[in-house]
């Protein structure tokens, strides 16, 4: 069991970041889905190591104080949502915007019917050009 | 079938990287090889982790403007070569350089005879102190 | 095999990161161990797929010029530490500190009784806060 | 606004398979969210008797595993209720609702209930 | 399965006082950090309505006057002030672990 998927620009407002079927992608069987194209969704229980790469150009004067953030979430059926993992980097000083990546990663238990995803501080910042962001996992 | 095997410096002017069996490196098999110091190359058609880490030491003012990307890219019998992952990081500000890491990891499915390598924008700025720079696959 | 821990602050000034079976951990059973809450310890012989997350907080001016280091170790019985894999970033110019995330992960071949650990160059500098720092392998 | 409401006979014979359905408006049951089957007997007891999610996986109380079946038809937005070998203990008001798949599982819209009396 | 004990099983209180019900879990009914122990109110003919969620999280739409609190084996749900329209039978019910369990409920009237 295992998904490897490709980031996709989104025009949602929202934190979680979009993902697709597309370019060269990996998934293994139907024991794995990608589900409303933002949730690597399980229904086999057991541990997985879970991988989210989020590359993002930010300029220090443009945003926020608070440094870009990239957290991998869990869904898991009758339980409050959670963090797995969470990676920050400080905006860079280049202009109009410095590149930069963050990889997570880590292995976890999953529930049938758990969902993982990765929300960002600020999705617009994200770099879609190939290669650059994209999430998996694969069942140990 | 796993590997893991260390950076080595060259005097290539070539952006791909070159590595070695050398240090606390990692070949399980003939059915995964290091060709010509710069790929990994499988026998074996599957599923792999292939992951890369990159440190790297520029200067913002002794660079291009264009951040510094590695890149690890797929080579298939019969097919283009392509680019799996990407991480961009901005060069620094510190002097004479500012250290920066980059990981890069993820799933793919890989035909018999396919090889992957690490593509770098500038290889002359990559580290290779002990442990530094390394590049590897399993097979899942 | 697996196991993921949990970063835990350390009033202790050893340069070794401390971690816990705390929050969302993995300890799948007792062939992994985490020791005196610094090190990972395998009972099998073979090859494990190691990682550290690491994030923290420095400033360029508050912090000395050498860039901030990770270091995943190794303690093998009746052999000398060595270092498996390395990852630097300099600190930021941000105020009062900021904020980056270094990942490393490889393939390596452990013997029983085998321990891996995290090293830093500054401990004061790492990020507890949920999900920011882990450290964790998986057995092939 | 989503609503939910039950629809099914009123009187079922012991030993034969009670049916009911619960209609869903306002609300597609493939979005999210698990759809459940409560009951309460006449002394006020309530039991949970199962869900289907909105991916259509099941699960059901352990002590009715042997007799339900909870299936769906996404074209209607209903999804369906079926308990065999009824005996008079059935007999109860019986309540569908939605529940938070990703969440606590509590029940935060009902149906209005439907009477089932079992009797020869 | 959990049995979870409402008391008392019914109760007078007059208006613009404190009704307090209590919910005991036969065991815990928390899970890494939050408790899954929820509160409905039924009126005679009508469903239950969900008033409180994960022990103390009001749910939208639900008067201030309702408050829950409680971790582990012992929760509670505080109506205060109590007003006529909050004459009905209460439940507790939990989902830490299946099947979801409900209390025997407890009636609250208003003098």
């Known amino acids: 069991i295992a998904a490897h998927v490709i980031s996709e620009a989104s025009s949602k407002t929202t934190s979680v970041l979009q993902w697709a079927e597309k370019g060269y992608y990996t998934m293994s069987n139907n024991l794995v889905t990608l589900e409303n194209g933002k949730q690597l969704t399980v229904k086999r229980q057991g541990l997985y190591y879970i991988y989210a790469q989020v590359t993002f150009c930010s300029n220090r004067e443009a945003s926020s104080q608070a440094p870009f953030i990239a957290s991998l979430c869990l869904k898991s059926p009758g339980r409050f949502e959670r963090i797995l993992l969470r990676a920050a980097n400080t905006h860079s000083s280049a202009k109009p915007c410095g590149q930069q990546s963050i990889h997570l990663g880590g292995v976890f238990e999953l529930q049938p019917g758990a969902s993982v995803f990765v929300n960002v501080t600020d999705p617009s910042q994200v770099s879609h050009g190939t290669g650059f962001t994209s999430f998996g996992l694969l069942k140990l | 079938i796993a590997a893991h095997v260390i950076s080595e410096a060259s005097s290539k002017t070539t952006s791909v990287l070159q590595w070695a069996e050398k240090g606390y490196y990692t070949m399980s098999n003939n059915l995964v090889t290091l060709e010509n110091g710069k790929q990994l190359t499988v026998k074996r058609q599957g599923l792999y982790y292939i992951y890369a880490q990159v440190t790297f030491c520029s200067n913002r003012e002794a660079s291009s403007q264009a951040p510094f990307i590695a890149s690890l890219c797929l080579k298939s019998p019969g097919r283009f070569e392509r680019i799996l992952l990407r991480a961009a990081n901005t060069h620094s500000s510190a002097k004479p350089c500012g250290q920066q890491s980059i990981h890069l990891g993820g799933v793919f499915e890989l035909q018999p005879g396919a090889s992957v390598f690490v593509n770098v924008t500038d290889p002359s700025q990559v580290s290779h102190g002990t442990g530094f720079t390394s590049f590897g696959l399993l097979k899942l | 095999i697996a196991a993921h821990v949990i970063s835990e602050a350390s009033s202790k000034t050893t340069s070794v990161l401390q971690w816990a079976e705390k929050g969302y951990y993995t300890m799948s059973n007792n062939l992994v161990t985490l020791e005196n809450g610094k090190q990972l310890t395998v009972k099998r012989q073979g090859l494990y797929y190691i990682y550290a997350q690491v994030t923290f907080c420095s400033n360029r001016e508050a912090s000395s010029q050498a860039p901030f280091i990770a270091s995943l170790c190794l303690k093998s019985p009746g052999r000398f530490e060595r270092i498996l894999l390395r990852a630097a970033n300099t600190h930021s110019s941000a105020k009062p500190c900021g904020q980056q995330s270094i990942h490393l992960g490889g393939v390596f071949e452990l013997q029983p009784g085998a321990s891996v650990f995290v090293n830093v160059t500054d401990p004061s500098q790492v990020s507890h806060g949920t999900g920011f720092t882990s450290f964790g392998l998986l057995k092939l | 606004d989503v609503q939910l409401q039950e629809s099914g006979p009123g009187l079922v014979k012991p030993s034969q398979s009670l049916s009911l359905t619960c209609t869903v408006t306002?609300?597609?049951?493939?979005?999210?969210?698990?759809w459940n089957w409560i009951r309460q007997f006449p002394g006020n007891k309530l039991e949970w008797m199962g869900y289907?999610?909105?991916?259509?996986?099941?699960s059901y109380n352990p002590s009715l595993k042997s007799r339900i079946s909870l299936t769906r038809d996404t074209s209607k937005n209903q999804f369906f209720l079926q308990l065999n070998a009824v005996t008079t203990e059935d007999t109860a008001t019986y309540y569908c609702?939605?529940?938070?798949?990703?969440?606590?599982?509590?029940?935060?819209?009902w149906g209005a209930g439907t009477t089932v009396t079992v009797s020869s | 399965d959990i049995v979870l004990t409402q008391s008392p099983a019914s109760l007078t209180v007059s208006l613009g006082q404190r009704a307090t019900i209590s919910c005991k879990a036969s065991?815990?009914?928390?899970?890494?950090?939050?408790?899954?122990l929820h509160w409905y109110q039924q009126k005679p003919g009508q469903p239950p309505k969900l008033l409180i969620y994960?022990?103390?999280y009001l749910e939208s739409g639900i008067p201030a006057r309702f408050s829950g609190s409680g971790s582990g084996t012992d929760f509670t749900l505080n109506i205060h002030p109590v007003e006529e329209e909050d004459a009905a039978t209460y439940y507790c019910?939990?989902?830490?672990?299946?099947?979801?369990?409900f209390g025997g409920g407890t009636k609250l009237e208003i003098k």
């Open positions: 609702a939605r529940s938070p798949y990703y969440g606590p599982w509590y029940f935060d819209v």
């Open positions: 306002g609300y597609s049951i493939t979005s999210d969210y698990a």
């Open positions: 289907i999610t909105y991916s259509g996986t099941t």
């Open positions: 065991q815990s009914v928390d899970y890494d950090g939050d408790s899954y």
């Open positions: 994960a022990a103390s």
């Open positions: 019910q939990q989902s830490n672990e299946d099947p979801n369990t």
